[in-house]
Interface confidence: low
């Protein structure tokens, strides 16, 4: 139903608090370098304007689209040209090209300082001094660093952030109460951001059809008792929500997500028996809970898939009549029977089935041609099963840090042109698959591991897209969304790579390493490991292990020394010389 004023409609639906928060997120995700105060000023101006439209929908400019209103507001920023360079050219365009232009300039790796958390007393004072500003700063800082963060979910994070401070700033031991909560929010936030980034990449790079296929598979696993028509309706609505959020339409996205949660809860009897608890929660918690809800039990006595999709004489007729509907039904039926498969595996199977039908339905004897299609699935299923088995064994043998190091070496050899910080970040995240998924029983390992790896490899893809340096990465990232992981797995050592010149500065360390947290110290060591492999890509595991062990001993020794800086200078030179000799540099 059309509204005279879109901005008034969204303001009334969402309420002032959510409206202001979502506009702040939207602006911070577009203009990531703008100071906090500038964004607050813009948000206040938009909010005041929205209120005039609520009072009179016919008032001047109230009939304009949200993109027009928000784009006009962003284009009033005086320093646009000097801060953002060519992004300022977007302002010369008309909608919808202007918004597309802003979207294209979103930066997945903005040059912003690392956020450093102050002491608990300082934060609690800031929280009590001005709670509203404190929470706005949280939204602003997260949104500008994660320009694709799922906005309605960020509201949920902010609610938990506020709750943590409200509770812990009154506690006897503030730090013991608050710090674990903030760590949990940080880690969950990074994971949430990365998962949403994959959804947006799926929509933007591979199109709506690819996203819908993903959604059919995932929702069919989650709601195996729901009928196909119900799953299709949910997929359509979910696609609209994510298309809006990925497109910067955050008010519409949040509004439609709330409607979808309402629909799911009103129809839970025909969707899933697991939704009851979620549906008793307030809106933000409810939506989050539904998104994370466990898979419902599979209906008993589901018939064999072969009857409808292989043995039936109507396979080609049904396929020809409505290809995507028939493939969607195949995907739905396969996914609801296989919660033990990853979504990407289910999509590979559906693609294989589609390719077979395309070929066979044009053949002289279609049935004879596609009769053995399910046999083609076997190697596709076994490949991730074997890979996960091998890597979980390696993880259990090495532990997380050394498992990450093994992946660092493996991936640096595959794509040595990629920047060291990206290789370290991505390999560390790939390595976390061990502690995240290997503890699960067999039936849950593959969906946990392979779908998580898809999220992490997408991080590599979006970071690499900003500064492309490797044709192999581009190829794996762009050819097929569902085959990204197998594509990277299949890469061997890059024989064309010319080793990096040795630079002693790269391996010069100082006493500041002694005061770093364990995590930061690991990152320093892993950075050195990547650089070693870039200098000596043919180095064996044994050689690298020996050098890394020497390095660890060197750091430990110098951190215990009285004159740490002198120790690092003198022993460091010896270590560099010994490492060069050991690796033949």
């Amino acid at each position: 139903d059309a509204h005279k004023s879109e901005v008034a409609h969204r303001f009334k639906d969402l309420g002032e608090e959510n409206f202001k928060a979502l506009v702040l997120i939207a602006f911070a995700q577009y203009l990531q370098q703008c100071p906090f105060e500038d964004h607050v000023k813009l948000v206040n101006e938009v909010t005041e304007f929205a209120k005039t439209c609520v009072a009179d929908e016919s008032a001047e400019n109230c009939d304009k689209s949200l993109h027009t209103l928000f784009g006009d507001k962003l284009c009033t920023v005086a320093t646009l040209r000097e801060t953002y360079g060519e992004m300022a050219d977007c302002c010369a365009k008309q909608e919808p090209e202007r918004n597309e232009c802003f979207l294209q300039h979103k930066d997945d790796n903005p040059n912003l300082p690392r956020l450093v958390r102050p002491e608990v007393d300082v934060m609690c004072t800031a929280f009590h001094d001005n709670e509203e500003t404190f929470l706005k700063k949280y939204l602003y800082e997260i949104a500008r660093r994660h320009p694709y963060f799922y906005a309605p979910e960020l509201l949920f994070f902010a609610k938990r952030y506020k709750a943590a401070f409200t509770e812990c700033c009154q506690a006897a031991d503030k730090a013991a109460c608050l710090l674990p909560k903030l760590d949990e929010l940080r880690d969950e936030g990074k994971a949430s951001s990365a998962k949403q980034r994959l959804k947006c990449a799926s929509l933007q790079k591979f199109g709506e059809r690819a996203f819908k296929a993903w959604a059919v598979a995932r929702l069919s696993q989650r709601f195996p008792k729901a009928e196909f028509a119900e799953v299709s309706k949910l997929v359509t609505d979910l696609t609209k929500v994510h298309t809006e959020c990925c497109h910067g339409d955050l008010l519409e996205c949040a509004d439609d997500r709330a409607d979808l949660a309402k629909y799911i809860c009103e129809n839970q009897d025909s969707i899933s028996s697991k939704l009851k608890e979620c549906c008793e929660k307030p809106l933000l918690e409810k939506s989050h809970c539904i998104a994370e809800v466990e898979n419902d039990e599979m209906p008993a006595d589901l018939p064999s898939l072969a009857a409808d999709f292989v043995e039936s004489k109507d396979v080609c007729k049904n396929y020809a009549e409505a290809k995507d509907v028939f493939l969607g039904m195949f995907l739905y039926e396969y996914a609801r029977r296989h919660p033990d498969y990853s979504v990407v595996l289910l999509l590979r199977l559906a693609k294989t089935y589609e390719t077979t039908l395309e070929k066979c339905c044009a053949a002289a004897d279609p049935h004879e041609c596609y009769a053995k299609v399910f046999d083609e699935f076997k190697p596709l299923v076994e490949e991730p099963q074997n890979l996960i088995k091998q890597n979980c064994e390696l993880f259990e043998q090495l532990g997380e840090y050394k498992f990450q190091n093994a992946l660092l070496v493996r991936y640096t050899k595959k794509v040595p042109q990629v920047s060291t910080p990206t290789l370290v970040e991505v390999s560390r995240n790939l390595g976390k698959v061990g502690s995240k998924c290997c503890k699960h029983p067999e039936a849950k390992r593959m969906p946990c591991a392979e779908d998580y790896l898809s999220v992490v490899l997408n991080q590599l893809c979006v970071l690499h897209e900003k500064t492309p340096v490797s044709d192999r990465v581009t190829k794996c990232c762009t050819e097929s969304l569902v085959n990204r992981r197998p594509c990277f797995s299949a890469l061997e050592v890059d024989e064309t790579y010319v080793p990096k010149e040795f630079n002693a500065e790269t391996f010069t360390f100082h006493a500041d390493i002694c005061t770093l947290s364990e995590k930061e110290r690991q990152i320093k060591k892993q950075t050195a490991l990547v650089e070693l492999v870039k200098h000596k890509p043919k180095a064996t595991k044994e050689q690298l292990k020996a050098v890394m062990d020497d390095f660890a001993a060197f750091v430990e020794k110098c951190c215990k020394a009285d004159d740490k800086e002198t120790c690092f200078a003198e022993e460091g030179k010896k270590l560099v010389a010994a490492s060069q000799a050991a690796l033949g540099l």
């Epitope: 100071p35 105060e37 450093v116 002491e119 700063k137 800082e141």
Partner: nanobody, 124 residues
């Protein structure tokens, strides 16, 4: 209100050292987080280092770690920045800043009071 006055800037050769000082007046110095920021010609202002009220925590930008050291003397209402192994890219106007309430140390908008700056030039 807090007034901040920086000193100690100057011209130095690459590899050389300088010590910047920032004297505060007009507030209870020991209740403020103190930070150093810098702005090179034609560039944006960037975080350099910060120190908590009682010197328990110190923070540094990656580009200065291991070379710069921040310290404070609450009895003298002064914060210092010892800069060693200076490089040409350290050339900038260095600002001292004070923050009473802060959510993040590295964000310049968190700092309520600023000095006028002291110029550091690293050149051979």
């Amino acid at each position: 209100d807090v007034q901040l006055v920086e000193s100690g800037g100057g011209v130095v050769q690459p590899g050389g050292s300088l010590r910047l000082s920032c004297a505060a007046s007009g507030g209870t110095f020991s209740t403020y987080v103190m930070g150093w920021f810098r702005q090179a010609p034609g560039k944006e202002r960037e975080f350099v280092s910060a120190i908590s009220q009682n010197s328990i925590h110190t923070y540094y930008a990656d580009s200065v770690k291991g070379r710069f050291t921040i310290s404070r003397d609450n009895s003298k209402n002064t914060v210092y920045l010892q800069m060693n192994s200076l490089r040409p890219e350290d050339t900038a106007l260095y600002y001292c800043a004070a923050s009473r309430f802060t959510s993040w140390y590295t964000a310049d908008y968190e700092y309520d009071y600023w000095g006028q700056g002291t110029l550091v030039t690293v050149s051979s």
